[in-house]
């Protein structure tokens, strides 16, 4: 690596993937193993993230960019930048300190993650229950009894909602 000759900061010419080494008269030195610099002019290299155990590598660390982790099958990411992996449960369950537990009556979970949520109370909207709820699905509310006059059109239950980015279970 060539010694930099900038008139202002001699480190400003050090490219990404290197650092300005004060111990070597401000020569641009390559980042050591397991470290990187994503921008030029850095006086230190950043530490690469390691994806180990329940984490798996989604993107390898390079001399210019950090690694990215996700979770091994049966787990899902939680927290900032996938800082944690949480165990998946089945639909109709939630994760507790004692493991996966079935949703209590009157609650449901249509995901492999998250908590059981109460069924919709149709009567609050003046509607009636068209399809009963289960551990895996919310109730489907239909028209109020007064709307069910002869000739009224049938109601098609909506597809279960999914979080963005979640593939069908």
């Amino acid at each position: 690596f060539e010694r930099t000759r900038s008139l202002q900061d001699p480190c400003s010419n050090c490219p990404a993937g290197t650092f300005c080494d004060n111990n070597r008269n401000q020569i641009c030195s390559p980042c050591p193993p397991n470290s990187f610099s994503s921008a030029g002019g850095q006086r230190t290299c950043d530490i690469c993230r390691q994806c180990k155990g329940v984490f798996r590598t989604r993107k390898e660390c390079s001399s210019t960019s950090n690694a990215e982790c996700d979770c091994t099958p049966g787990f899902h990411c939680l927290g900032a930048g996938c800082s944690m992996c949480e165990q998946d449960c089945k639909q109709g369950q939630e994760l507790t300190k004692k493991g996966c537990k079935d949703c209590c009556f009157g609650t449901f979970n249509d995901q492999k993650r998250g908590i059981c949520r109460p069924w919709t109370n149709c009567s609050l909207d003046g509607k009636s229950v068209l399809v009963n709820g289960t551990k895996e699905r919310d109730v489907v509310c239909g028209p109020s009894p007064a709307d069910l006059s002869p000739g009224a059109s049938s109601v098609t239950p909506p597809a279960p909602a999914r979080e963005p980015g979640h593939s069908p279970q």
Partner: antibody, heavy 119, light 112 residues
């Protein structure tokens, strides 16, 4: 580089807000930015961290929970520590530090700012 | 809470000596351990990360080893610039209610 400011003398029970201005890198690159303190003649103590990515997740040591609040302004590339109900034992040099590893390993530190809690 | 225990707390040595500092974690932290050097009135400087990786700009006379709960920092041949206090730090982010991160108490390396 990281430059802390906002330290000074404050009475017990008072409040103080520390700032840490970052230059040469952007918070938008998603780091853990943290505060570490060192009481006079004592060792280092981790206080709090915040993830500069979109989630902004925060993490606190037990000694900081309830009294200290970490925050950041990505547009200003600045980290903050709001300290309330200060006690004499909070007297220390407060450093801000950067972690890219996700495992409390700080490769970049500020020069520190001294907070003195005394009546 | 994670507790890091360093030994010895003070170490007297001469230039050219091989110096070893130990750090013990109260629970298994895999290789999530860093070593820092601090001089009076200055901020700490990262020496070693992931227990054994040398940080950028750090001389090769510094080395780290260990995994799980037992870790070691070694200075192969002590130089005048190495008289300072050394700290180990271990930890990892779990959740905001159960975060593990702690420094050891420090080891002061002084001139014999």
């Amino acid at each position: 580089s990281l430059v802390e400011s906002g330290g000074g003398l404050v009475q017990p029970g008072g409040s103080l807000r520390l700032s840490c201005a970052a230059s040469g890198f952007s918070f938008t690159s998603s780091y853990y930015m943290c505060w570490v303190r060192q009481a006079p003649g004592k060792g280092l103590e981790w206080i709090a961290c915040i993830y500069t990515g979109s989630s902004g997740s925060t993490y606190y040591a037990n000694s900081a929970k309830g009294r200290f609040t970490i925050s950041r302004d990505n547009s200003k590339n600045t980290l903050y520590l709001q300290m309330n109900s200060l006690r004499a034992e909070d007297t220390a040099v407060y450093y801000c530090a950067r972690d890219s590893s996700s495992y409390y390993m700080f490769n970049l530190w500020g020069q520190g700012t001294l907070v003195t809690v005394s009546s | 809470a994670l507790v890091m225990t360093q030994s010895p707390s003070t170490l007297s040595a001469s230039v050219g000596d091989r110096v070893t500092i130990n750090c013990q974690a109260s629970e298994d932290i895999d290789n999530y351990l860093a070593w820092y050097q601090q001089k009076p009135g200055k901020a700490p400087k990262l020496l070693i990360f992931y227990a054994s990786d040398l940080a950028s700009g750090v001389p090769s006379r510094f080395s780290g080893s260990g995994s799980g709960t037992e870790f070691t920092l070694t200075i192969s041949s002590l130089q005048p610039d190495d008289f300072a206090t050394y700290y180990c730090q271990g930890g990892y982010y779990t959740s905001s209610t159960d975060t593990r991160g702690a420094f050891g108490g420090g080891t002061k390396v002084e001139i014999k």
